[in-house]
Interface confidence: medium
Amino acid sequence: EEELQIIQPDKSVSVAAGESAILHCTITSLFPVGPIQWFRGAGPARVLIYNQRQGPFPRVTTVSETTKRENMDFSISISNITPADAGTYYCIKFRKGSPDTEFKSGAGTELSVRAKPS
């Protein structure tokens, strides 16, 4: 059984205000069973951006069909970016349980927001 890796290939992404940002994340194994969640920031102050199992998250859509059992692409698109969205985004795998427990994190992608072109 292959060891799970969380691949966030972009160190940083720069998006103009009002546009959409695509944050890439793929996983290399379906095990352990459990959801993927996206957070902005790390530590206790981190903000949940997307949870595969709950919602809705009105500005967030998944790039691929995450409900398919064999899906390994958990990239997300965040619409209508504002300066408040700037920060480092982490794609995190949780192990199924009561409650689910954090298993492994991607390296993070820093989102910077440029002024809207005039």
Partner: antibody, heavy 119, light 108 residues
Framework: DVQLVESGGGVVRPGESLRLSCAAS????????MNWVRQAPGEGLEWVSL????????YYADSVKGRFTISRDNSKNTLYLQMNSLRAEDTAVYYC????????????WGLGTLVTVSS | ETVLTQSPGTLTLSPGERATLTCRAS??????LAWYQEKPGQAPRLLIY???SRATGIPDRFSGSGSGTVFTLTISSLQSEDFAVYYC??????????FGGGTKVEIK
């Protein structure tokens, strides 16, 4: 202009150790992830190791894991590769390579230093 | 680990001819692919990143294309200084960062 200058290569016997250095200039060294890449005689390029700008994140190729140690001294703008338990198959030119600040490709490379492991 | 396979191993052409080099990935790397040029005694040089973006100072006779698993480096009209070894590198699936085996472009 970015400059990367490797040193420390030489001829050693199997099982011996060697420490490579890479002196960097022309950029803010601590802001960039750095890598070692090697090329055995007549072979292609092989990634060896990566260290983040802060030194907190480190990765190794399976072929060197447990034998090689990457480190950096940001106050001296220098990258290191400590190579222990050297084997004949470690014979190669070792390049120091600076990563792009957004992606993991290599913007700049040194000229390399040759390591020969032979009995 | 993503394996990159370059073809052909050697390309024998004359100055002024067009060179087409191919790099195939064992799984999708989207457009996270770079090309490098290597000459004896010189540091490898970044040519292309993001599959198709030319690095600073690279002449426009060099172009890259492709996405997913198949990528191409094209040199539209070979100059004497272009005879070298070319490597592709993926930076989607990492670590390890992986390189192709190289294509040698030599003078006919």
């Amino acid at each position: 202009d970015v400059q990367l200058v490797e040193s420390g290569g030489g001829v050693v016997r199997p099982g011996e150790s060697l420490r490579l250095s890479c002196a960097a200039s022309g950029f803010t060294f601590s802001s960039y992830d750095m890598n070692w890449v090697r090329q055995a005689p007549g072979e292609g390029l092989e990634w060896v190791s990566l260290i983040s700008g802060s030194g907190e994140i480190i990765y190794y190729a399976d072929s060197v894991k447990g034998r090689f140690t990457i480190s950096r001294d940001n106050s001296k703008n220098t990258l290191y590769l400590q190579m222990n338990s050297l084997r004949a198959e470690d014979t190669a030119v070792y390049y120091c390579a600076k990563e792009n600040n957004r992606y993991r490709f290599f913007d700049d490379w040194g000229l390399g230093t040759l390591v020969t492991v032979s009995s | 680990e993503t394996v990159l396979t370059q073809s052909p191993g050697t390309l024998t052409l004359s100055p002024g001819e067009r060179a087409t080099l191919t790099c195939r990935a064992s799984q999708s790397v989207y457009t996270y692919l770079a090309w490098y040029q290597e000459k004896p005694g010189q540091a490898p040089r970044l040519l292309i990143y993001g599959a198709s973006s030319r690095a600073t100072g690279i002449p426009d006779r060099f172009s890259g294309s492709g996405s997913g698993t198949v990528f191409t480096l094209t040199i539209s009209s070979l100059q004497s200084e272009d005879f070298a070894v070319y490597y592709c590198q993926q930076y989607y699936d990492r670590p390890p960062l992986t390189f192709g085996g190289g294509t040698k472009v030599e003078i006919k």
